[in-house]
Interface confidence: low
């Protein structure tokens, strides 16, 4: 970067090289070039010469002033016009940064996704800081009082094997950068209460010919958790509002859920589960589309096959990919 150049003088920033976004700052340049009494001193920001707000302080020093500096990063350097030189001579350069101190991390959440072997802790970092901000996650056993610390730039995965201090812990997060440090409230967790069951997946759908046609949605999870509560939400693709059905589920077999739907309409389904009575939910599953038949033939559907639809007896639809879905309900 610009900081690695050989300097013939000195460049510095007041109040500091890293400063709060929106501040007024001064950049000073002092020449120390052999056999040169600078005629003029020039400042460059990101390679472009600055024309305004430059003040000559003395024979070797000048100041560039910025009001309300809002750029997260800039490379500054200054040059001198020396008599008898045909080009400007480089004096020195510096990378400057502006940003914000971290907000207090809030909404600290720790979950264990079944089979992952990790406890995943996340938090709301607050507003963007624009500068390098590190987070230290503190995990303290309430049984042994032993505390472990983990350094990260965003979220953290902590191996459950490393959580040797029993089942109950306090977790909190410290955020720090060059402009400040903040600490979250402490979250008390019990490892048995934060497990999120293995993902529930909708595999297929069929509409059965009956006096009142009914659609059966087939869905399953590999979870080993005995008591699981699930929600399936569904709506016509033209609607904004979801309908939600609740299920207390035992995943020893594939689940079959019945719906009485309007004919000749494309519907979308999603499912999510939680360990019964616990706080955290899975993310909603991938979007699963199914179009009901016009009259009463039996129809089967596959996940997001766009408009997979025949006028004949079946429309096959097997769950294959992953569509990013509205995860408003991820964990909460």
């Amino acid at each position: 970067g610009i900081t690695n150049i050989n300097c013939s003088g000195h460049i510095w920033v007041e109040p500091a090289t890293i400063f709060k976004m929106g501040m007024n700052i001064s950049i000073y340049c002092q020449a120390a070039i052999k056999n040169c009494q600078p005629r003029k001193l020039h400042f460059y920001k990101n390679g472009i010469k600055e024309r305004f707000q430059i003040t000559r302080i003395n024979k070797t020093t000048a100041r560039l002033w910025y009001k309300n500096f809002l750029e997260p990063h800039a490379s500054m350097y200054c040059t001198a016009e020396c008599p008898k030189h045909f080009q400007e001579t480089l004096i020195c350069g510096k990378d400057i940064s502006s940003g914000y101190p971290p907000d207090i991390p809030d909404e600290v959440t720790c979950v264990i996704y079944e089979y992952s072997g990790n406890m995943t802790c996340t938090w709301n970092a607050g507003k963007l800081t624009y500068i390098d901000t590190k987070y230290v996650v503190h995990v303290k056993s309430l049984e042994t009082e032993e505390e472990q610390q983990y350094l990260t730039s965003s979220y953290i995965n902590i191996s459950t094997d490393s959580l040797q201090g029993g089942k109950k812990y306090l977790v909190w997060v410290q955020a720090a950068n060059a402009l400040g440090m903040e600490e979250s409230k402490q979250l008390q967790i019990h490892l048995d209460d934060i497990v999120i069951p293995s993902a529930a997946v909708i595999s297929r759908a069929e509409t059965i010919n009956a006096t009142v046609p009914k659609t059966i949605i087939y869905w399953d999870s590999q979870t080993t958790i005995e008591k699981v509560s699930c929600e399936m939400r569904y709506k016509a693709t033209t609607n904004q509002t979801w309908n939600v059905k609740e299920f207390d589920t035992n995943f020893t077999y594939v689940q079959q859920s019945e719906f009485y739907l309007e004919p000749n309409i494309k519907y979308v389904f999603q499912v999510r589960c939680q360990e019964t009575g616990k706080r955290y939910w899975q993310p909603w599953s991938s979007l699963f589309f199914h179009k009901t038949p016009e009259t009463v033939p039996q129809v089967t559907s596959k996940a997001f096959q766009h408009d997979t639809w025949n006028s004949g007896l079946t429309v096959a639809s097997i769950s294959t990919g992953h569509l990013t879905s509205d995860n408003r309900g991820d964990i909460g």
């Epitope: 909404e107 709301n124 939400r233 509002t241 979801w242 939600v244 609740e246 509205d326 909460g332």
Partner: antibody
Framework: DVQLQESGPGLVAPSQSLSITCTVS????????VHWVRQSPGKGLEWLGV???????DYNAAFISRLSFSKDNSKRQVFFKMNSLQPDDTAIYYC???????????????WGQGTTVTVSS | DIQMTQSPASQSASLGESVTITCLAS??????LAWYQQKPGKSPQLLIY???SLADGVPSRFSGSGSGTKFSFKISSLQAEDFVSYYC?????????FGGGTKLEIK
């Protein structure tokens, strides 16, 4: 501490529009949804709509033609606008937070103190 | 829209007594019901959600029951600060709707 505070004009002339700002602290609008509710002696508590954490909105169908919500996550502000006010829109207007992420199923665990709006010429 | 019919509109009771308020939904709403308390000149405050779950910091003398279309809210051993207004709210479908309220008064 979680807090919501509404600021509004107090008095609005008939047929004019009403703008209210709800400024929040103690939580992030990127993670929580904010409802708008009004209360008048004649009609009791009426739900007007919600702005979801992702910025999408749902409005009470009775008001959909004259309501709009928006927000600025970085400033922690939610904006409410209602057009074509009539005297029977006189009410206390509240913003309120969903208590956690269950789509469409959230009670409102924190409310603003409310801003009283009178529609009169 | 789902209509929420709350009764009684007002009720008189004495300190230490129990009172029950009823809320009827015009169609089934599962257990998606909340109860709020409102003191004069203040905003509503959440007491019960999901029909039976007590919100954080709410005293255990408040309780909720019911599912489907009929719901009850009970205050056992009334304290002086409980003589205010109470509202039910369905969270099942848009638009969310509230009951007309019940005002508790000291006998």
């Amino acid at each position: 501490d979680v807090q919501l505070q509404e600021s509004g004009p107090g008095l609005v002339a008939p047929s004019q529009s009403l703008s209210i700002t709800c400024t929040v602290s103690g939580f992030s609008l990127t993670n929580y949804d904010v409802h708008w509710v009004r209360q008048s002696p004649g009609k009791g508590l009426e739900w007007l709509g919600v702005i979801w954490s992702d910025g999408s909105t749902d409005y009470n169908a009775a008001f959909i033609s004259r309501l709009s919500f928006s927000k600025d996550n970085s400033k922690r502000q939610v904006f409410f606008k209602m057009n074509s006010l009539q005297p029977d829109d006189t009410a206390i207007y509240y913003c309120a937070r969903n208590n956690y992420y269950r789509y469409g199923r959230n009670p409102m665990d924190y409310w603003g103190q409310g801003t009283t709006v009178t529609v009169s010429s | 829209d789902i209509q929420m019919t709350q009764s009684p509109a007002s009720q008189s009771a004495s300190l230490g007594e129990s009172v029950t308020i009823t809320c009827l939904a015009s169609q089934t709403i599962g257990s998606w019901l909340a109860w709020y308390q409102q003191k004069p000149g203040k905003s509503p405050q959440l007491l019960i959600y999901a029909a039976t779950s007590l919100a954080d910091g709410v005293p255990s003398r408040f309780s909720g029951s019911g599912s489907g279309t009929k719901f009850s809210f009970k205050i056992s051993s009334l304290q002086a600060e409980d003589f205010v207004s109470y509202y039910c709210q369905q969270l099942y479908s848009s638009p969310l709707t509230f009951g007309g309220g019940t005002k508790l008064e000291i006998k």
